[in-house]
């Protein structure tokens, strides 16, 4: 570490101290074997060499082990959500090993210094693995590294420093500052596990981007697009806080990504899906909602390996909290005229009937201009299961584009009062869930009469063909 | 809106000590590190240290460690710096800043006080 | 340390002229620099952080760059309230080190 007074500058001055003098020296990275998921029972620390806190402790050599990895702190202590994740795997693994590495001394440091010892902190993860094993029955296949922040380009440095190859490796949220761009070895890479899966939820182009924005992994999720996450919000945090701030926002953003693998962890049967997709404007036009070779996948725990990816970056919506998953649909809609519409862009809204439910209006997202005679495509997600569509209410309203544009439609507008109504005709509505993968088609209910103006709707029932369901579609992951 | 509020300026005598004072307001105050900055009169600023409130952490200067000792009070939200033996040398004017995490930068500054070593 | 230079101590520049301010640090600094402006009141705000991040509040006739050890401080047309000083600073490693800081004046 560069920093003069850091803990490994005061080991290093300890150890070159005679004997008869030296302090004993807290080990600046412990592996605390977490017994119990009450967070005030200690646990037991692991120590390289000592096979006795192994048998004492019951760690289980053929199951599954995990260990977390916290990132850089600012307090110096452990934070709730590790706690969280410690029962969440506890409940979802019962017999696992569920190891916390506690590199607090290392970590509670300036973010500069703190990066600077992910290197040693790694190469500690990756001597214990190796003396792990040595032990009968220990298999590297069988251990998952879970780390937050910086703490992911740790366990990437674990996974590059092991003998032999860990079985799997999730980032969350790994840090961005210091290793955007930097070269595979000083990051978090696909070349660190069989298996490495990714969140990114807070990415930024503009200001500092406190996640890695490019991806590191055999697949890479984007929650939101991997930056601002609902509910987290300065309005939202201001609710809550005593002060809202860009640091609870920060915070509440970039821990995202522990929660939503919590969630995939306790919230088994509601399980998100993300979508393999270019980039989040593509995403978010709707045009990536396919399951089709691999290209959707569960996020978090639930995620299926997928080792003939390398950065394959994935997109999906979430709800605001817990369970996070949403309904996703494509909505492609053929808008056959504008009548008298001037330089006035159309936002539509629709509302989904379902055999379960009905969805509140959406507003349908504008990513590009609207084109006439043209099929749109749109990203609609419902945070409830709707069941079947039954039918869609459309509406519209023009929304201009700027005030002189505006002023040219009043001025217009006042020089031709007996102007006809703006409108629009639309025939039919193509829909297909991400989470099933139906494609259903959509027609007016009454085939006379498909012009819509401004505030008035018009009603699109299942066309006679019903559902469709292509039979080259055959989802790669269980599908609800 | 944030705002840190530093006492009035001091005039002490060369060998005395001074408590300096950095009242925080607009926001959380155990959630950012208060960093203390020194200015000599026409000449460039030195990082003192700075104080954690969320667990009481305190990193020094090297040069400013027997000089300066920070400490802080929760319940009124303020952080102080005490300059100890002090000399002409200590004659400047002291700033307090709120550090940003992850871009160690300093995003907010107090108004400054000066401090005045005289016989 | 990481020493941090600032070459130029005083500069005169006209109202609406570009200026640029140079810093040179001591050793690679991972683009953890930082711009501050001092006033004639003694006020310090914050500029630029993370070498070309525009702090909030401050106009866009701002704007920073740079990498390794050597960066800069742009101001593209200057006006009468940018009279102050400026001064860079590293946040790479502790202890945190200024540049000598440079006093911009009207010619």
């Known amino acids: 570490s560069p920093t003069p007074f850091g803990p490994e500058g005061q080991l290093a001055d300890e150890l070159h101290k005679p004997k008869a003098i030296q302090t004993e020296v807290k080990p600046s990275v412990r592996f605390n074997l977490r017994t119990s998921k009450d967070p005030e029972h200690e646990g037991c620390y692991l120590s390289l060499g000592h096979s006795q806190p192994l048998e004492d402790c019951g760690f289980n050599m053929t199951a599954k082990t995990f260990f977390i990895i916290h990132g850089w702190t600012m307090s110096g202590i452990f934070e709730n959500w590790l706690h969280k994740l410690v029962s969440a795997l506890h409940t979802r693994e019962k017999d696992a090993n569920v190891v916390v590495v506690d590199w607090l001394p290392l970590a509670h440091q300036l973010y500069t210094d703190a990066v600077n010892n992910t290197r040693v902190v790694g190469h500690s993860i990756a001597r214990m693995l190796d003396w792990l094993q040595e032990k009968d029955d220990f298999s590297l296949g069988n251990v998952h590294l879970i780390g937050y922040s910086l703490g992911a380009h740790v366990a990437g440095y674990a996974g590059n420093f092991v003998k032999g190859t860990v079985g799997r490796i999730t980032g969350l949220d790994p840090a961005g500052p210091m290793f955007e761009g930097a070269d595979i070895h000083k990051r978090l890479s696909p070349d660190d596990a069989d298996f490495v899966d990714v969140l990114h939820t807070y990415t930024r182009s503009f200001g500092l981007s406190i996640g890695i924005q490019m991806p590191v992994g055999h697949i890479d999720i984007y929650p939101n697009g991997g930056d601002f996450q609902p509910g987290c919000g300065l309005n939202d945090v201001l609710g809550s806080m005593a002060y809202g701030t860009i640091t609870e926002v920060v915070k509440c953003e970039h821990e995202r990504a522990v929660h939503l693998f919590v969630d995939s962890l306790v919230n088994q049967d509601k399980p998100s899906f993300a979508f393999q997709c270019t980039d989040s404007n593509r995403f978010k036009k709707g045009i990536c909602l396919s399951c089709r070779k691999n290209r959707c996948n569960s996020i978090g725990y639930n995620a299926k390996k997928m080792r003939n990816k390398r950065n394959s970056k994935m997109y999906l919506k979430t709800r605001a909290g817990m369970p996070f998953r949403v309904y996703h649909y494509q909505m492609k809609i053929h808008v056959f005229s504008y009548k008298n519409m001037g330089e006035i862009e159309p936002t539509f809204y629709v509302t989904l009937y379902g055999t379960n439910a009905d969805s509140q209006t959406l507003p349908l997202e504008i990513v590009e201009r609207i084109e006439q005679n043209a099929t749109n495509t749109f990203l609609v997600y419902t945070e409830e299961d709707l069941g079947d569509l039954l039918k869609i209410q459309l509406t519209w309203e023009g929304a201009s584009q700027s005030w002189y544009n505006l002023w040219k439609e009043l001025r217009s507008y006042l020089s031709q009062p007996h102007n006809p109504g703006r409108e629009l005709n639309i025939r039919r509505i193509r829909v297909k869930s991400g989470e099933t993968q139906r494609k259903l088609t959509f027609c007016a209910e009454d085939p006379e009469n498909t012009s819509i103006s401004p505030g008035r709707e018009l009603w699109f029932r299942k066309c006679r063909d019903g559902w469709r369901m292509k039979n080259e579609t055959s989802p790669t992951v269980e599908l609800p | 809106q944030v705002q840190l509020q530093q006492s009035g300026a001091e005039l002490v005598k060369p060998g005395a000590s001074v408590r300096l004072s950095c009242k925080a307001s607009g926001y959380t105050f155990t959630k950012y590190t208060i960093h203390w900055v020194k200015q000599r009169s026409g000449q460039g600023l030195e990082w003192i240290g700075w104080?954690?409130?969320?667990?009481?952490?305190?990193k020094y200067n090297e040069k400013f460690k027997d000089k300066a000792t920070l400490t802080a009070d929760k319940s009124s939200r303020t952080v102080y710096m005490e300059l100890s033996r002090l000399t002409s040398e200590d004659s400047a004017v002291y700033f307090c800043?709120?550090?940003?995490?992850?871009?160690?930068?300093?995003?907010?500054w107090g108004q400054g006080t000066l401090v005045t070593v005289s016989a | 340390d990481i020493q941090m230079t600032q070459t130029t101590s005083s500069l005169s520049a006209s109202l609406g002229d570009r200026v640029t301010i140079s810093c040179r640090a001591s050793?690679?600094?991972?683009?953890?620099l930082n711009w501050y402006q001092q006033q004639p009141d003694g006020t310090v705000k914050l500029l630029i952080y993370y070498t070309s991040r525009l702090h909030s509040g401050v106009p866009s006739r701002f704007s920073g760059s740079g990498s390794g050890t050597d960066y800069s401080l742009t101001i593209s047309n200057l006006e009468q309230e940018d009279i102050a000083t400026y001064f860079c600073q590293q946040g790479y490693t502790l202890p945190w080190t200024f540049g000598g800081g440079t006093n911009l004046e009207i010619k």
């Open positions: 104080f954690y409130p969320g667990s009481d952490s305190i």
């Open positions: 800043a709120r550090h940003e995490e992850y871009t160690n930068s300093l995003a907010y």
């Open positions: 050793q690679d600094i991972s683009n953890y």
